[in-house]
């Protein structure tokens, strides 16, 4: 049954706006993963590649960011854009490739030997307890390499993946983004025709775990296209 | 450290509308999801509404929705609640929050709705 | 909705004792979606667990919290004069956001 596969990521209570509450984006959203309200094109193939409408860097790839594609151009009209490589120029971290987040205006490397999240001038109490704190990279202080920041634990807000414990991804939950458990076998996931093409999705699931990927549950091959039931399946 | 500060509350008559602003400082403003939550006076805390980092993203409580718009300006690391079509029972103290789980909270700023 | 019950609405202890604080969900939340606040007269409220049981930064070791499904538990092991206070739980599983009525701390 549905039931049975749904897991911490899936939605158990419908979202707005069956949900009780009302969501309005800059354009589709969708009322569970996998399903999307007209209008959208979350489901664009890579063999019809065209610019993929965003609203927020979280519905592009892990390479993308969502911004308008000409300097000064119509807010309203962004698309997914190619990361920005180390010394070039950026304006958030978003806009930076992974293994570099924004620093005075230029995308500079991160340290790896510490916690990928922001830090706040408070050190020593941020290192001193579980909370962990996302802000403020212009603030970052180089701390002694014994100084490991706490990942974050579920249900905890998250920036990037890399900012959760092992076992976690970052996902979108409503208007935050917070740690989640990456799916196990037999949970249904949400399959992404094109790489990063998340959508509009209220919140997201996590990926499928390491030997897994998602797949038409076997059953659900005679269903229509669009109601098809993902799950995590072994290769 | 992270601050936020609200202001804009006010005595309103009935019908009449408001807006309030929460200045943040102290973190990366675009970053974070941010929250409006209100507290009526000796009653308990409830959600109003809440807006993605890019503000993108708004939700509402059926309570307050079409009257209510949450907005941010990035620019500016400042919050929005334009309130319209007030009602007694919106008296409150109305407080911005960060997050989706509240963890810094401004001070609250006092809206009263009154003929 | 998701309606929070908590109980007691009411506890009065002594400082140095223990406070067991019981919030119960109206439906599964499945995940550990749910914050606990303390606040104190004419002060906003402060968080002090995220996640069920991750105490936010600042927050003494004496709190802690636990629980899954549909039974969650604030405890504060041993009770300081600045702990008593009216205290709120919260779940961010879905939409509408909900909070318990509160229990106040008092002093017996």
């Known amino acids: 049954t549905l039931n049975s596969v749904l897991n911490s990521n899936a939605i158990k209570n419908l979202p707005p706006p069956l949900g009780g509450a009302a969501g309005h984006p800059g354009s589709a959203v969708s009322a569970a993963p996998g399903i999307l309200y007209p209008g959208g094109n979350k489901y664009q193939t890579i063999d019809n590649y065209q610019p993929y409408p965003c609203a927020e860097d979280e519905e592009c790839g892990t390479d993308e960011y969502c911004a308008s594609p000409t300097r000064g151009g119509d807010a309203g009209v962004q698309i997914c854009l190619a990361c920005r490589k180390r010394r070039k120029r950026c304006m958030r971290h978003a806009m930076c490739c992974p293994g570099n987040y924004c620093k005075n205006g230029i995308c500079v490397s991160s340290d790896q030997n510490h916690f990928r999240g922001e830090i706040e001038e408070t050190i020593t109490e941020s290192f001193g307890n579980d909370h962990s704190t996302l802000d403020g990279y212009s603030r970052r202080t180089t701390l002694s390499s014994k100084m490991y920041h706490t990942k974050g634990q579920e249900g905890s807000v998250c920036l990037r993946s890399s900012d959760c414990a092992s076992g976690l991804c970052c996902a979108r939950h409503f208007w935050s983004k917070i740690c989640k458990p990456v799916l196990k076998e037999g949970q249904v996931c949400t399959k992404h025709r094109r790489k990063g093409s998340h959508g509009l999705e209220i919140f997201q699931r996590c990926y499928c775990g390491e030997g897994l990927s998602c797949r038409i549950q076997k059953d659900h091959h005679q269903a229509s296209n669009s109601s098809r039931l993902h799950t995590c399946q072994r290769h | 450290q992270v601050q936020l500060v609200e202001s804009g509350g006010g005595l309103v008559q009935p019908g009449g509308s408001l807006r309030l602003s929460c200045a943040a400082s102290g973190f990366t403003f675009n970053n974070y999801g941010m929250t409006w939550v209100r507290q009526a006076p000796g009653k308990g805390l409830e959600w109003v509404s809440g807006?993605?980092?890019?503000?993108?993203?708004?939700y509402y409580a059926d309570s307050v929705k079409g009257r209510f718009t949450i907005s941010r300006d990035n620019s500016k690391n400042t919050l929005y609640l334009q309130m319209n079509s007030l009602r007694a029972e919106d008296t409150a103290v109305y407080y911005c929050?960060?997050?989706?789980?509240?963890?810094?909270w401004g001070q609250g700023t006092l809206v009263t709705v009154s003929s | 909705d998701i309606v929070l019950t908590q109980s007691p609405a009411t506890l009065s202890l002594s400082p140095g004792e223990r406070a067991t604080l019981s919030c119960r969900a109206s439906q599964n939340l499945f995940s550990p979606y749910l914050a606990w606040y303390q606040q104190k007269p004419g002060q906003a409220p402060r968080l002090l667990i995220y996640g069920a049981s991750n105490r936010a930064t600042g927050v003494p070791a004496r709190f802690s919290g636990s629980g899954s499904g549909t039974d969650f538990t604030l405890t504060i092991s041993s009770l300081e004069p600045e702990d008593f206070a009216v205290y709120y739980c919260q779940q961010y599983m879905t939409l509408p956001l909900t909070f318990g009525q509160g229990t106040k701390v008092e002093i017996n």
């Open positions: 807006i993605s980092g890019s503000g993108s993203y708004t």
């Open positions: 929050a960060r997050t989706i789980y509240m963890d810094y």
